[in-house]
């Protein structure tokens, strides 16, 4: 149960928790029984776990002190459950020159300070992308910056001081891209009140198509925390996210190994996002690319994912093959695609939850099919699930800890594939482990790129 006793304070906490989870994690309050305190709590508990998991709290399923504290923290109004990288539907601006207009100014700050804070916030994103932003003072801008209080012309009214600080809409026409700041906050240039620059960097991230990140160091983390604006920098997670949408700055501004430049195959620090066999080949996925290794041959070739499968996204996170069916399953965020005979099947992507994962699972780190048992192993954070491909359902008793059942592997893995009828090859960062699943132990430790003769 999320809560056991029914004091008025705890009742208030439950109601507050429900509203928070409805707003940011999609809890369907209509599905909760009227007698909430007697309610067994599965729906609520699952959403609490989902929130705790996303925001890096201890996953208890209870409305404990740290969870309630986090729920009361000032934050962005955009929901959390759409996994990081892009907003649902994946909108991006289809151009590199983007205009913005400041519709009205908060009385809390000098106009020049507002202009400066907003300009610097856009600059944060233009520094790491090919995007160029220019301010216009009249006419229709792509991104409208608005200070408003309460109900203000969308479905998402502000809530007074504290709570929701701002929200923004992903790229698109009309309201698309617009960033709204709650005028009931006290906006500042410093650490007092709410810092406009820091909030604007976050909201512009949404305006460009990013969703929330579960990395507490990321500017796209949902809650507000002041950091020194003079030393402020985007996290690696933020940069990876925005560059997956727009690429990196061109020519002389090039970043080291951005998402859209081909990674060096023999870089000793190279890691992979996903690896799977496809017939007698091995596919190694990284960012927008995959390498193709034909078994027992030294030659490898690099390709864009989009050149083979134009409808698939970059940044594939997990993959597995069922060779007997000529099927390959590819995963990104909470969606998966089915490839049959190297062709994408129609009516995909579909939700990973159709496999039977609980709602707090938002992405798969790695997956592997074992044809001997006709089971697929799904690795998520430090746990794994086992799925019966014949019965099309999860085996009971899962998830289990990776470290408990795969000796020497874990706690988390990046990728895994099955080969030679007895080995799993686990990838963790730049390391790879050959694991004999019959002996249940590691038989070799290799570099991740050892398959390429590096």
């Amino acid at each position: 149960l999320p809560l056991n006793s029914s004091t008025s304070l705890e009742k208030n906490n439950v109601l507050f928790g429900e509203r928070y989870l409805e707003k940011f994690y999609g809890l369907e309050i209509n599905k909760l029984p009227v007698t909430k305190m007697k309610y067994s709590g599965n729906l609520m508990k699952e959403k609490i776990q989902e929130m705790q998991h996303f925001l890096g709290l201890k996953v208890t399923g209870q409305l404990d002190t740290s969870t309630l504290e986090m729920m009361h923290a000032p934050r962005c109004g955009v929901p959390d459950v759409h996994h990081f990288r892009e907003m649902p539907g994946g909108p991006v601006w289809r151009k590199h020159y983007i205009t913005y207009r400041i519709n009205n100014y908060t009385p809390d700050m000098n106009r020049e300070d507002v202009d400066y804070a907003i300009r610097k916030a856009f600059q944060v994103w233009s520094n790491v992308t090919p995007l160029k932003f220019s301010k216009i003072n009249t006419g229709m801008a792509d991104i409208l910056v608005v200070f408003a209080r309460g109900a203000h012309g969308d479905f998402h009214a502000f809530d007074g001081k504290g709570g929701i600080l701002a929200h923004a809409f992903g790229p698109g026409s009309g309201i698309g891209g617009d960033a709204h700041f709650d005028e009931d906050e006290f906006w500042t240039t410093h650490s007092g009140g709410t810092n406009l620059f820091l909030t604007a960097v976050h909201e512009i991230g949404h305006s460009l198509g990013l969703g929330h990140s579960s990395d507490p160091k990321a500017v796209m983390f949902p809650t507000y925390k002041y950091v020194d604006i003079n030393t402020f920098r985007l996290s690696a997670d933020d940069i990876r996210g925005i560059q997956s949408l727009y690429g990196d700055p061109k020519e002389n501004q090039r970043l080291p190994n951005p998402d859209n430049s081909e990674p060096a195959l023999c870089d000793p620090n190279l890691s992979f996002d996903a690896v799977t066999t496809v017939g007698n080949k091995i596919f190694f996925f990284k960012d927008r690319f995959f390498w193709l290794k034909v078994s027992e041959r030294p030659k490898t070739s690099v390709n864009l994912i989009s050149s083979l499968w134009p409808t698939l996204p970059s940044g594939i996170e997990a993959a597995y093959e069922i060779e007997a069916r000529n099927q390959v399953f590819l995963f990104k965020d909470d969606k998966y695609w089915l490839i049959s005979n190297l062709r994408p099947e129609p009516n995909y992507p579909k939700s990973i939850h159709s496999f039977g994962f609980p709602n707090f699972v938002k992405k798969i780190d790695a997956a592997v099919f074992n044809p001997r048992f006709y089971r697929t192993y799904f690795f998520v954070d430090n746990q794994y699930w086992r799925y019966d491909e014949r019965r099309q359902m999860m085996d009971p008793g899962y998830p289990k800890l990776i470290t408990k059942n795969f000796q020497g592997i874990g706690p988390k893995i990046d990728a895994v594939f099955y080969s030679k009828n007895k080995y799993y090859y686990f990838f963790q960062g730049s390391n790879q482990f050959e694991y004999d699943f019959l002996l249940q132990r590691i038989t070799k430790t290799l570099k991740s790129n050892s398959w390429f003769g590096c």
């Epitope: 369907e28 459950v81 907003m87 649902p88 539907g89 408003a148 012309g153 479905f155």
Partner: antibody, heavy 122, light 103 residues
Framework: EVQLLESGGGLVQPGGSLRLSCAAS????????MHWVRQAPGKGLEWVSY????????HYADSVKGRFTISRDNSKNTLYLQMNSLRAEDTAVYYC???????????????WGRGTLVTVSS | DIQMTQSPSSLSASVGDRVTITCRAN??????LNWYQQKPGKAPKLLIY???SLQSGVPSRFSGSGSGTDFTLTISSLQPEDFATYYC?????FGQGTKLEIK
């Protein structure tokens, strides 16, 4: 071609219940917010409810809050409106409408169904 | 709460006329205003979104303008098929409608 087809309307007594359905085709249903809008005979349009792409996020007009429940089944490309404790003033043609956006609704309806008539009368 | 007031509530005009319908919000809604056309027994059809953007497939004789609290829908030269009811809307709020009839 985008198509929305409502069904489930009919005559119901005050206090009764009805479940409306809206079958969607011609677009990726699971990517978009969906809405119900109603129109009483000879009157204007009234927004009723909306639901987010995954089914989690719902909003209701004050006039139906606590009585109506919006839901969706993305595997069937179908939107639903469960209407309980119906009143005479709920008599209207109910339209389902597709939002132009797939995240954080703007309430801009680019496609509408033909509507289904709900009559609440004893 | 935001309210939308449309005027006039009805209007008689002739083919070829220039017609203007106005919509006023009781507080600023920036450019978040849309216009719909509805013919008897039919579903509404989106004409203009974001105050002035023409929805694809809508004839260019329809135009929208305004921002903040005051908005207008203009039909530059009325055609027989334009006689209908017009609604302004933002988020979950519709204006009460303007019925455009043949004079």
């Amino acid at each position: 071609e985008v198509q929305l087809l409502e069904s489930g309307g009919g005559l119901v007594q005050p206090g009764g219940s009805l479940r409306l359905s809206c079958a969607a085709s011609g677009f990726t249903f699971s990517d978009y917010n969906m809405h119900w809008v109603r129109q009483a005979p000879g009157k204007g349009l009234e927004w009723v409810s909306y639901i987010g792409p995954s089914g989690g996020y719902t909003h209701y007009a004050d006039s139906v809050k606590g009585r109506f429940t919006i839901s969706r089944d993305n595997s069937k490309n179908t939107l639903y409106l469960q209407m309980n404790s119906l009143r005479a003033e709920d008599t209207a043609v109910y339209y389902c409408a597709k939002d132009i956006r797939g995240a954080y609704s703007s309430g801009l309806f680019d496609y509408w169904g033909r509507g289904t008539l709900v009559t609440v009368s004893s | 709460d935001i309210q939308m007031t449309q005027s006039p509530s009805s209007l008689s005009a002739s083919v070829g006329d220039r017609v203007t319908i106005t919509c006023r919000a009781n507080q600023s809604i920036y450019t978040y205003l849309n216009w719909y056309q509805q013919k008897p027994g039919k579903a509404p059809k989106l004409l203009i979104y974001a105050a002035s953007s023409l929805q694809s497939g809508v004839p260019s004789r329809f135009s929208g303008s305004g921002s903040g609290t005051d908005f207008t829908l203009t039909i530059s030269s009325l055609q027989p098929e334009d006689f209908a009811t017009y609604y302004c809307q933002q988020a979950g709020i519709f204006g009460q409608g303007t019925k455009l009839e043949i004079k």
